[in-house]
Interface confidence: medium
């Protein structure tokens, strides 16, 4: 299925609020009323689709230098070109230990290609420890463990997702570097398909073992908002999703995999310029709590609940949601205190369903694991009410949206 015209339409703004944050030397109002940004001179920094549009103040000289935003799961700091720290965040891969650097030849010679890479450490993404990621030529890393066809839709780390074609030039390479504490992917001298005359782009994404994510931009030869999204989505930011299984109406004994994007951060593309950088620092999540007491007493922005049978703390909105539902955790947690669980054997329960979505033996039409293997060709058509990848752009941790059904 080749990309359809208009397949990458820009998502519209969310239902915004200005989150806590400061611009150096300037205070920001802690919160705006939903859907309302009052000051006309505010410029949009990013969208946090777990909470809406985030606004930022501009400095008197109109040059944004450092901007901080709170996105529930991450705090982002944007460093402008004049900010020394933006240079410090750039990892000089050329100076790294040669044995830790790999030029990925498949990715470096190909258009619209992806390749799986194993990290040397567990990287916490939205609180989930990941060991395997998928690097794509189009300026992003797919963070999902289940491969599906609409790769650009969700579960990504995207310093600059766009229609890059490393195969255009021998100078274009996709390089990665792993020293055990940081994993860096660098898209080096890559050209936009059809826009080669604009020049080459060089940028990188760094995944730190503590969960920090850094986007660093060395060469951005054109205004990012001008990049066409007609052949490929254009996005900068983070996204995660969970997968759930629903009974298929057509085949009662089978279940249909659907993916829900529960959180997304979109940076304002106009802020992506040469020598700028963005740093995402992870905020605590329910998943980090290992005991009922710690879970129930946490003062996170999330509504954490303890599931005794799974021995897990969760808001119910993470990649383990299927298990959370299968084991009746939402019901179990209602109105109960930690003392109520102490006499119970947490090994005795079994899920409401005998199907485990985490088996290596998912029955699919090929050896790759795809979302929604029961769907037809028609199910892959883009949702006209959604963003470019067919995903709704208004899902939030508190809002259940329409799932995206992605066929094999």
């Amino acid at each position: 299925l080749s990309p359809q015209p208009g397949a990458g339409h820009d998502e519209g703004p969310g239902s915004g609020w200005a989150a806590k944050g400061t611009v150096r030397g300037w205070n920001r109002r802690a919160r705006e009323s939903p859907g309302h940004v009052s000051e006309p001179d505010r410029t949009q920094l990013s969208q946090d689709l777990g909470g809406g549009t985030l606004a930022m103040d501009t400095l008197p000289d109109n040059r944004t230098r450092v901007v901080e935003d709170n996105h529930s799961y991450y705090v982002s700091r944007l460093y402008g070109p004049s900010e020394p720290h933006s240079r410090e965040l750039w990892v000089d891969v050329a100076e790294a230990n040669r044995s830790q650097v790999k030029i990925h030849t498949i990715l470096s010679n190909t258009h619209r290609q992806a390749s799986r890479v194993v990290l040397s450490f567990d990287f916490p993404f939205y609180g989930h420890p990941l060991r395997q990621i998928t690097i794509a030529t189009g300026g992003f890393i797919f963070m999902g463990d289940v491969i599906h066809r609409m790769l650009t839709a969700t579960q990504y780390v995207a310093p600059l997702m766009a229609n890059f074609n490393p195969g255009y030039s021998d100078n274009s390479t996709v390089v990665y570097f792993d020293n055990g504490t940081v994993f860096v992917v660098q898209w080096d001298h890559v050209y936009l398909q059809g826009w080669e005359d604009k020049g080459s782009f060089t940028f990188q994404a760094a995944l730190h073992h503590d969960g920090r994510i850094v986007f660093a931009y060395k060469e951005i030869p054109m205004s990012v908002p001008e990049i066409s999204s007609s052949q490929h989505p254009v996005k900068t930011g983070l996204s995660d999703a969970f997968m759930i299984l629903n009974p298929s109406p057509d085949v009662p004994e089978s279940r249909r995999r659907s993916i829900f994007e529960y959180h997304r951060i979109e940076l304002d593309p106009s802020k992506v310029t040469s020598m700028s950088a963005v740093e995402f620092t992870p905020l605590p999540t329910c998943l980090q709590h290992r005991s009922c007491d710690a879970c129930m007493s946490s003062d996170l922005t999330f509504n954490c609940s303890w599931c005794h049978v799974l021995q897990r703390c969760s808001s119910g909105f993470d990649r383990y949601r299927q298990e959370w539902m299968d084991y009746g955790c939402a019901q179990e947690a209602e109105g109960r205190m930690c003392e109520d669980f102490q006499d119970e054997d947490h090994d005795s329960a079994s899920p409401d369903t005998s199907f485990s979505p985490y088996d290596g033996d998912l029955t699919t039409t090929s050896s790759s694991l795809f979302i929604d293997s029961l769907t037809t060709e028609d199910d892959t058509k883009l949702n006209p009410y959604a963003g470019g990848d067919g995903l709704q752009n208004n899902l939030s941790p508190k809002t259940k949206g329409t799932p995206v059904h992605l066929g094999t």
Epitope: L1, P3, H111, Q113, A114, S115, R116, L151, T365
Partner: antibody
């Protein structure tokens, strides 16, 4: 039924040409990268060439580069291998194989998850 | 090119016994490794992909492990239909390369 069926093999003299075909059925052909893999008599498997789902990307083993051309016709659900300047060492059973990929925007070249039954190419004078 | 080396070349095992096949890559291939089974006169058949994930329809007695440069295919209890040649293959880098094969024969 999901299957691949090769044809076009036979006896050819060194320096000659041959065109292999592989007819696919039972799956959406254009969504998958396809490949040719060969096996010389009594020997192991050797990857020959690969083509992406749209046909936009092709790759070759060094041993056949410049002599073999892989192509596909998605409207006919058919994969081809044009073999020119054949040598004795090209003698083998040629398998067409589907690459487990994901498509739409991207290809992820993974394992060969579906194979044809093979067609024998003999290069001899 | 990444060279894949399998050992042993031949493995003699009795039915019901456990078989362990090894595959070593000359440089890291991450988890981008597959195992195939081939019987005489037949095309290869995919058993394992991504180093450890069983392909559709493959019995649970087949399991794969490893990452980086060292990989193992284990057949927990050999059945008569498992006697065949087994190949590993990396798909981490061009050119795609196979090991030379391990023949599992009846002891």
């Amino acid at each position: 039924e999901v299957q691949l069926l090769e044809s076009g093999g036979g006896l050819v003299q060194p320096g000659g040409s041959l065109r292999l075909s592989c007819a696919a059925s039972g799956f959406t052909f254009s969504r998958y990268a396809m490949s040719w893999v060969r096996q010389a008599p009594g020997k192991g498997l050797e990857w020959v060439s690969i083509i992406s789902g749209t046909g936009g990307n092709t790759y070759y083993a060094d041993s056949v580069k410049g002599r073999f051309t892989i192509s596909r016709d998605n409207s006919k659900n058919t994969l081809y291998l044009q073999m020119n300047s054949l040598r004795a060492e090209d003698t083998a059973v040629y398998y067409c194989a589907r690459i487990d990929t994901f498509a739409y925007y991207y290809s992820l070249y993974r394992a060969f998850d579906l194979w044809g039954q093979g067609t024998l190419v003999t290069v001899s004078s | 090119e990444i060279v894949m080396t399998q050992s042993p070349a031949t493995l003699s095992v009795s039915p019901g016994e456990r078989a362990t096949l090894s595959c070593r890559a000359s440089q890291s291939v991450g988890g981008n490794l597959a195992w195939y089974q081939q019987k005489p006169g037949q095309a290869p058949r995919l058993l394992i992909y991504d180093a450890s994930t069983r392909a559709t329809g493959i019995p649970a007695r087949f399991s794969g492990s490893g990452s980086g440069t060292e990989f193992t295919l284990t057949i927990s209890s050999l059945q008569s239909e498992d006697f065949a040649v087994y190949y590993c293959q990396q798909y981490n880098d061009w050119p795609l390369t196979f090991g030379q094969g391990t023949k599992v024969e009846i002891k």
